[in-house]
């Protein structure tokens, strides 16, 4: 039987027969918060094969192993992640293996094994025959293994009954407990899975299969389930659901949503049955099972009880995230803030339609409207007294509106207003006038041609560059010298750069009243003879990184018709050239036959360019004699080896109390100071644990049911 | 242990109506497509109808469209077949059959109930 | 409609043969096709889906192959039990059709 949406089992112990009849969980399974110590051992669930999405385990007293709960576990799909792992067991404090010896394969994420104090055997289990990769796996803070004494089966009695590979050039037996070895396949099985006997099972299956080559005797299968067999791809007419298997259109229609009971139902797209359109697709009419691409943004419609939104902070423009239609009235008034400009960007920059008035007052924080990016059309159908569809009052940093070379925007009915704006130029808002087609509607005393502007540089000259020059990490630009009428009022330029992956960034963007600038800046002086032009050496670049970079001069306040001159250039684009990538990273050798090694590697993090071909060089090493000098299986203490992190027991130290030379080459030695790099990876690793709890404390502590 | 039991069979006169009732027990009833099949006197399977989990979709054969109608209750594990306008020729044995697998309504039926006869006779 | 066409329609063996029944559908229904087993005054027994996957508690001298248009059920080393009345069954597509069934009787 199949069994979900997801099985949270907590507090009570005997919730655990809820898996009684599951051959197949089709979501998550959580066993967790169960602080009174039971026994676990009437409780068995051998018909439990798969878990679609992931299994957490989480402070399960009195649980000991995961074996006689379930075992005939071979496959988590991982199709849903928790924090990007599908195993996690957690705080488990009287665990003392995983035991799940029937564990094939994990097909997505990795896992997370932490903070289970009495945890052995996970140094006996490959990882890599069950996940794809192993390099995100998070094993961290169990019992330590020279306390564990893991022993494999046989071992002891000199009879080893379980395979050996080979693990951080560890080659040592397999095994989940003391009685069962981890199985392996043959090699000539590749990556297919095989019978308990050693018989290669059909390539469609996926984990185990009960009868060789055939694709009606698999445990699970690696694509699909569809009436008995494991498919490639779903039949005609069926729908892959929740990564596994195959429905009818009338199974699709029928599901019940686990998340919200009042959700439209299912859609099929691109022959999968879903919860909801994907990203850029919504459904062809309210109730159809279908989904149409949306054309620009997916619209949203987002409606005010209170008919007028009030946006004086972040948090209240989050309400507005992912909206395109805004059915009221805004009224934003932000006086302060972090970060402001990006933050309302991302909470409000899908706003396409404003059905009432836009009204911007006291905003100091704000130097752009460019964070509505979206906003094309102000329908007015609610104005303020005065018939004011668009009002601007009093903001004292306000320099643009938006960017009107590449926005069309229409308000449909009301007039403007616009007063006390200080470094808004009175031409911004005419150039307003002409795009929105609200000329002709204002009366003269609706923009105030004293009180806009009367603290900015609105007359605005050209500064052209005359010269560029870049290297790997630096660019030079040199620019025509301005010459403003009288030569005095030329202060200094300000020369403005940022990384700009595309030509689409304005003087405005991610800028605020607050200090906040996505811009770096940097002030250049006048040179002093006359005749050289001004110029800047940037250093410090990114290669093959395309800039953006614009120039103003600083002038002094000119009175010229109650307005002030200056001088600016266009934004200016212009890549850094190309440099040797970084390392390539997270580097795996495996050997797969006695004369093949396997290499796999990701990019490097900075390609530096566009990569064209990696170079693999190897080399024969000589056997290391020291693996055959100590019999292992004596009861003797193991020698003591040169750790390659300068780290020692303990117990050493009161042994052999003299202090060497760090990096000596006799004995134990002193730890070395950690250098910078350590400490950084230290407090990153500790901060990426914060975090890891954080989530799994808020995504599984839910108020208790009324 | 799954288990399907067919009631309401009997002896009617050509034309008439009658209700069959299979109730299901042992597994998760809503989940899976349910279907009649039926067996004339000395004759070989022949399928009548096919009612998906939820309900949403029904199928028939062509000899009895328009004159049954397939529907189950999910609430009490139990699917009918409404049978009108009998005919001599709808005379036979019908078995109720669970579908094999959850999630699509064609497939072969793994579980069957013991039958119950439906003689048209004038 | 689909037609499905077993042959024999009747065969006779004795304990510890091997029988072979064959199935033919009139037009290529991939690998969707079942097997049942019934006998006298009981209901069918699913025994084979999907053309060779074998139905679990059905013992494995049960077998089934072939795809597309053309089906064999095979039963090897017969058993006192096995002698019955065997259909074929295509679920490709609506209207579901069964095969006219194949009379399995003792030599």
């Known amino acids: 039987e199949i069994c979900g949406p997801g099985i949270d089992i907590r507090n009570d112990y005997q919730q655990l027969k809820r898996l009684e009849n599951c051959t197949v969980i089709e979501g998550y399974l959580h066993i967790l918060l169960i602080s009174k110590a039971e026994d676990y051992r009437s409780y068995r669930f051998p018909k439990l094969t798969v878990i679609t999405e992931y299994l957490l385990l989480f402070r399960v007293a009195g649980l000991e192993s995961l074996g006689d709960l379930f075992p005939n576990l071979t496959v988590i799909r991982g199709w849903k992640l928790f924090y990007n792992y599908a195993l996690v067991i957690f705080e488990m404090t009287n665990l003392k293996d995983i035991g799940l010896y029937n564990l094939r394969n994990i097909t997505r994420g990795a896992i997370r094994i932490e903070k289970n104090a009495d945890l052995c055997y996970l140094s006996t289990v490959d990882w890599s025959l069950i996940l794809d990769a192993v390099s995100n796996n998070y094993i961290v803070g169990n019992k330590p293994p020279k306390e564990c004494g893991d022993l494999c089966p046989g071992t002891m009695e000199e009879k080893p009954m379980c395979e050996k590979t080979t693990i951080n050039n560890e080659y040592n037996y397999r095994c989940w407990t003391t009685n069962r070895c981890q199985k392996m396949c043959p090699s000539t099985c590749g990556k297919r899975a095989c019978t308990e006997n050693n018989e290669c099972c059909h390539p469609e299956c996926l984990g185990s299969c009960s009868a060789p080559d055939n694709d009606t005797a698999c445990v699970a299968c690696r694509h699909y389930y569809y009436a008995g067999v494991c498919v490639p791809a779903c039949p005609p007419n069926t729908y892959r659901f929740e990564g596994w298997r195959c429905v009818d259109r009338d199974f699709c229609a029928n599901i019940l949503s686990a998340e919200s009971s009042d959700s439209e139902g299912f859609v099929i797209h691109d022959g999968e049955c879903m919860q909801e359109c994907p990203s850029g697709f919504i459904r062809n009419g309210s109730q159809s099972m279908y989904c149409i691409p949306c054309e620009g943004p997916c619209p949203k419609v987002c409606e005010e009880e209170k008919k007028t939104k009030t946006i004086d902070s972040v948090t209240s423009a989050q309400m507005l995230q992912g909206c395109t239609i805004f059915k009221g009235n805004l009224l934003i008034n932000i006086r302060r803030g972090n970060n402001i400009a990006s933050e309302l960007e991302n909470f409000m920059g899908l706003i396409e339609v404003v059905t009432g008035y836009v009204k911007i007052r006291h905003s100091h924080a704000l130097v752009s409207l460019s964070f509505l990016k979206n906003l094309r059309l102000i329908l007015g159908e609610e104005q303020l007294e005065g018939n004011y569809s668009f009002y601007v009052l009093d903001n004292q940093n306000l320099q643009q509106l938006w960017d009107w070379d590449h926005r069309n925007l229409t308000i449909k009915a009301g007039k403007m207003y616009f007063a006390f704006n200080p470094k808004l130029c009175v031409s911004e808002i005419y150039r307003m006038e002409e795009v929105t087609g609200t000329k002709g509607r204002q009366s003269k005393g609706d923009i105030n041609t004293r009180n806009n502007g009367e603290r900015a540089s609105c007359e605005s000259d050209v500064l052209h560059f005359t010269s560029t020059t870049t290297s790997k990490n630096r660019i030079i630009i040199t620019w025509h010298r301005y010459r403003p009428p009288d030569y005095r009022d030329l202060i200094s330029f300000t020369v403005y750069y940022k990384e700009a992956p595309f030509k689409n960034v304005t003087e405005y963007d991610g800028q605020d009243a607050c200090g906040s600038n996505s811009w770096n800046m940097v002030d250049v002086d006048l040179p002093p003879n006359k005749d050289v032009e001004p110029g800047i050496l940037l250093h410090g670049l990114k290669p093959w990184t395309q800039y953006a970079v614009y120039v103003k001069a600083v002038t002094l306040t000119m009175v010229e018709n109650d307005h002030i001159r200056g001088a600016k250039s266009e934004i200016l684009y212009i890549r850094t050239n190309a440099s040797v990538p970084s390392i390539p990273l997270d580097v795996l050798s495996a050997s797969n036959s006695s004369s093949q090694l396997i290499v796999k590697w990701n990019p490097p993090s900075l390609p530096n360019g566009n990569l064209s071909y990696y170079i693999v060089r190897w080399q024969r090493q000589p056997q290391d004699g020291y693996l055959y000098r100590h019999n292992y299986c004596s009861k003797d203490k193991i020698p003591i080896r040169k750790y390659a992190d300068g780290t020692i027991d303990i117990e050493e130290v009161t042994e052999n109390p003299k202090t060497e030379v760090c990096g000596g080459e006799k004995g134990p030695c002193c730890a070395c100071p950690k250098t910078e790099a350590e400490k950084q990876a230290e407090k990153e690793e500790a901060e990426y644990r914060k975090v890891f709890e954080n989530f799994l404390h808020n995504s599984i502590f839910v108020p208790r049911p009324e | 242990e799954v288990q399907l039991v067919e009631s309401g069979g009997g002896v009617v006169r050509p034309g008439g109506s009658l209700r069959l009732s299979c109730a299901a027990s042992?597994?998760?009833?809503?989940?899976?497509?349910m279907s009649w099949v039926r067996q004339a006197p000395g004759k070989g399977l022949e399928w009548v109808s096919t009612i998906s989990g939820s309900g949403g979709s029904t199928y028939y054969a062509d000899s009895v469209k328009g004159r049954f109608t397939i529907s189950r209750d999910n609430s009490k594990n139990t699917l009918y077949l409404q049978m009108n306008s009998l005919r001599a020729e709808d005379t036979a044995v019908y078995y109720c059959?669970?579908?094999?697998?959850?999630?699509?309504?064609?497939?072969?039926?793994?579980?069957w109930g013991q039958g119950t006869t439906v003689t048209v006779s004038s | 409609d689909i037609q499905l066409t077993q042959s024999p329609s009747s065969v006779s063996a004795s304990v510890g043969d091997r029988v072979t029944i064959t199935c033919r559908a009139s037009?290529?229904?991939?690998?969707?096709l079942a097997w049942y087993q019934q006998k006298p005054g009981k209901a069918p027994r699913l025994l084979i889906y999907a053309a060779s996957g074998l139905q679990s508690g059905v013992p494995s001298r049960f077998s089934g192959s072939g795809s597309g248009t053309d089906f064999t059920l095979t039963i090897s080393n017969l058993q006192p039990e096995d002698f019955a009345t065997y259909y074929c069954?295509?679920?490709?597509?609506?209207?579901?059709?069964f095969g006219q069934g194949t009379r399995l009787e003792t030599k």
């Open positions: 059959a669970k579908e094999r697998g959850s999630g699509w309504s064609l497939d072969n039926m793994d579980v």
């Open positions: 069954q295509q679920a490709s597509s609506f209207p579901i059709t």
């Open positions: 042992g597994f998760t009833f809503s989940s899976y497509a």
């Open positions: 037009q290529g229904i991939s690998r969707w």
